[in-house]
């Protein structure tokens, strides 16, 4: 039809940075590049109708749909979704053409559906319809990579079997230590999934897509580094892969390296070798030791040995299921106002743990780092002083594991008062939980010095606010007491602190604060 | 002493297939790269691919792929090289050359096996 | 593929007089671990062909040290500070940086 408009039709994501519900606009944010949806005309419809490639969004995203109207004129238009009429405002961009708006924020289940846009132009009515639908992410996946020999080549592959479909990097590093930190200098990282250069120091392959980043270090035996006073330990789950580099440097390239499983040679096809010159004319041998799916029975110890160099072993041990290893009962601190702390977890693990860091229902993220001995440890120190309760939690594919720790810091008490027409009562949240006393000021007593014993009420350990104890004291008022001014005192270790009371009628109490050290 | 012992001349007929052998000792089989070279006569060198006895990946050159087949057997410590769909251009000597690394400085050279293509 | 260009082609030589044989690359050789992977050949009349220089400068096991060899990325040079009867033969160079390996035409040493 020769009237027809040219139509197109586009999806733009944005940033998100508002939150709002489905508006129709005539200028949306800014945002990322436009994706075309391919308006085509609906087949066998009543009408002009143009479809537009389905839209999957996820939950919370931003995102706009647009239509440019390339005919001649004015345009008029209407959004319709699920039977309710939406605004819409049409405006031209600098090629003249109609431009039709509708940008949806902070995507949710209720904004799903059929978007229909009518549009009326001088020649030709026409309707578009979007479908907009929420990206079901409980089908996402993230796992760990793991690697496999490339078929006749000496090159390994990364694979990670991921939804949606991840991207695979190799992080490489050739320095020792802490310089092969991920932000490095001496990092470089090579985003394909086939690696050739396996003589490097540090080799790991990471996985990433919406779920995050999943990484695997190829498991290295340095023979020309001193050995770590415990043995090297790697754990995997029946039917994993198991990849073991052994790597040593010499003077000359006549020396030879072997893999020896419980003192019995790696069968041929469980091992390859390669070799090349390194700095100074020296030569780099590397032997692979490789299982495509370990059993039970390929537990034990791997020694790799060298005409050259003294031999090296690891301990592999085979499991049917993940693990986590470490002490959960729970542990106090007491610490000083200003002392520096940490809390730590030393824990062994299998597959490698997701962790988090808990206090008054904040999460913290959590670092890990591996020590030599096999186990690794998680610090958080970022409690900025705030005493109570804090949690760590982790979990991997097979286990849990959750560790609760009180921090108590140190501090002279603090004293809060509070009257009612029957009492008094005085809150301090100072530690070691403090003891109370009451005094009466009366003409006999201007220095309140007169104790009060009677219808006093002590609790320890009032409330717990995310595991800061509070201790109270309360005073049934008496007519001995009625009218009087009342001092109550709040004493720990660290020293003193006081609130007076006027106990005359009900209402608003003059509070006087009075800090002794 | 270090040594690498190649089969016998051949002479085929355009069309049909060679296996040459080379036999390696005196040495640790599995830690060195093995190539092959191979010299027409009166020209010059050509290199043909590479194998890695330890694993037995290969890299061929691209002119004869799909031709070339390199293959080991670490019970004999020896390397074999096929070359199929033989024609009178692939009159030549081929070499069996050990390789340091697996970037040439080939240090140890087999005695060449001449092998003839004619109708 | 990596062009290999030896020059001259032929080289008459005097007993005990130096020698000298250029090769060039079409690229740079220079591998980014600071070699330069050129190696340099000799076969003698009748004999299979044997390791002289490797990584553009270090002298094979068992060579004379009348054989040197030098230069970077694409120009190199192998030297005879004096030649002996028994070096006469075809001189190859070839690069060693990427597959496929090439070799250079050859240069042939003879003794005038």
């Known amino acids: 039809n020769q009237d027809l408009p040219v139509i197109k039709c586009v999806l733009i994501n944005h940033k998100n940075n508002d939150s709002s519900v489905g508006k129709s606009s005539s200028y949306p944010m800014v945002s990322e590049s436009p994706e075309d949806l391919g308006c085509a005309l609906r087949p066998q419809s009543s009408g002009t109708v143009y479809e537009a490639a389905a839209v999957e969004v996820d939950v919370s995203a931003s995102i706009t749909l647009q239509v440019l109207v390339d005919a001649p004129g004015n345009i008029s238009c209407l959004w319709v979704f699920k039977h309710s009429s939406l605004n819409c405002q049409p405006h031209f961009d600098l090629q003249n053409r109609g431009v039709v708006s509708m940008v949806i924020l902070k995507m949710t289940e209720t904004q799903a559906g059929e978007y229909l846009l009518f549009i009326q132009s001088e020649a030709t009515n026409y309707t578009i319809l979007f479908t907009v639908s929420i990206r079901n992410t409980l089908l996402y996946t993230l796992r760990r990579p793991y690697f496999r020999k490339m078929e006749n080549q000496d090159a390994l592959v990364c694979i990670s079997e991921s939804v949606p479909e991840p991207i695979v990097e190799w992080v490489l590093c050739d320095s020792q230590g802490e310089s092969c930190k991920e932000e490095s200098p001496a990092v470089v990282k090579k985003e394909e999934k086939v690696l050739h250069e396996l003589f490097g120091t540090d080799i790991r392959c990471c996985a990433r897509n919406e779920l995050g980043r999943e990484c695997t270090r190829l498991f290295t035996i340095d023979l020309n580094q001193t050995p770590q006073t415990t043995l090297p330990q790697l754990f995997l789950k029946v039917g994993e892969p198991l990849w073991i580099r052994c790597k040593a440097v010499h003077v000359n390239h006549g020396f030879g390296l072997t893999w020896e499983l419980e003192n019995k040679a790696l069968e041929e096809g469980n091992y390859f070798e390669m070799s090349t010159y390194s700095t100074n004319r020296t030569m780099i041998r590397i032997l692979f030791a490789f299982v495509s799916s370990v059993a039970r029975n390929d537990t034990g110890y791997y020694t790799c040995s060298s005409s050259k160099h003294p031999s090296q072993s690891a301990l592999v041990t085979i499991v049917e299921k993940g693990f986590i290893n470490a002490t959960n009962s729970s542990e106090d601190y007491e610490i000083d106002q200003y002392e520096e702390f940490c809390f730590s977890v030393r824990f062994k693990a299998y597959p490698q743990i997701r962790c988090t860091w808990t206090f008054s229902r904040k999460s913290f993220p959590c670092e890990q780092k591996g020590l030599d001995n096999g186990y690794s440890i998680s610090k958080f120190c970022n409690h900025k002083h705030q005493p109570g309760e804090y949690i760590f939690h982790a979990e991997n594919d097979d286990a849990q594991f959750t560790k609760m720790f009180t921090l108590n810091i140190r501090r002279k008490p603090q004293v809060l008062a509070e009257a009612s027409a029957s009492q008094a009562s005085c809150f301090s949240d100072g530690y070691p939980l403090p003891s109370w006393t009451w005094k009466k000021c009366s003409d006999k007593s201007p220095n309140c010095t007169e104790e009060i014993t009677e219808g006093v009420w002590n609790r320890k350990a009032n409330r717990k606010v995310f595991g800061q104890w509070v201790s109270s004291s309360t005073l049934n008022m008496s007519e001995a007491i009625k009218g009087f001014l009342v001092k109550c005192c709040a004493y720990n270790s660290l020293g003193t602190s006081c609130e007076t009371i006027l106990l005359n009628s009900p209402g608003p109490f003059p509070f006087i604060q009075d800090n002794i050290s | 002493q270090v040594q690498l012992v190649q089969s016998g001349a051949e002479v085929k007929k355009p069309g049909a297939s060679v296996k040459v052998s080379c036999k390696a000792s005196?040495?640790?089989?599995?830690?060195?790269?093995m190539h092959w070279v191979r010299q027409a006569p009166g020209q010059g060198l050509e290199w043909m691919g590479i194998?890695?006895?330890?694993?037995?990946?290969?890299v061929y050159a691209q002119t004869f792929q799909g031709r070339v087949t390199m293959t080991r057997d670490t019970s004999t410590s020896t390397v074999y090289m096929e070359l199929s769909s033989l024609r009178s251009e692939d009159t030549a000597v081929y070499y069996c050359a050990r390789g340091i690394g697996s970037k040439g400085a080939f240090d140890i050279w087999g005695q060449g096996t001449m092998v003839t293509v004619s109708s | 593929d990596i062009v290999m260009t030896q020059s001259p082609l032929s080289l008459p030589v005097t007993p005990g007089e130096p020698a000298s044989i250029s090769c060039r690359s079409s690229q740079s050789l220079l591998h980014s671990n600071g070699y330069n992977y050129l190696d340099w050949y000799l076969q003698k009349p009748g004999q299979s062909p044997q390791l002289l220089i490797y990584l553009g400068s270090n002298r094979a096991s068992g060579v004379p040290d009348r054989f040197s060899g030098s230069g970077s990325g694409t120009d190199f040079t192998l030297k005879i500070s004096r030649v002996e009867a028994e070096d006469v033969g075809v001189y190859y160079c070839m690069q060693g940086l990427q597959t496929p390996y090439t070799f250079g035409q050859g240069t042939r040493l003879e003794i005038k």
């Open positions: 005196g040495y640790t089989f599995t830690i060195y790269y």
């Open positions: 194998i890695n006895p330890s694993g037995g990946s290969t």
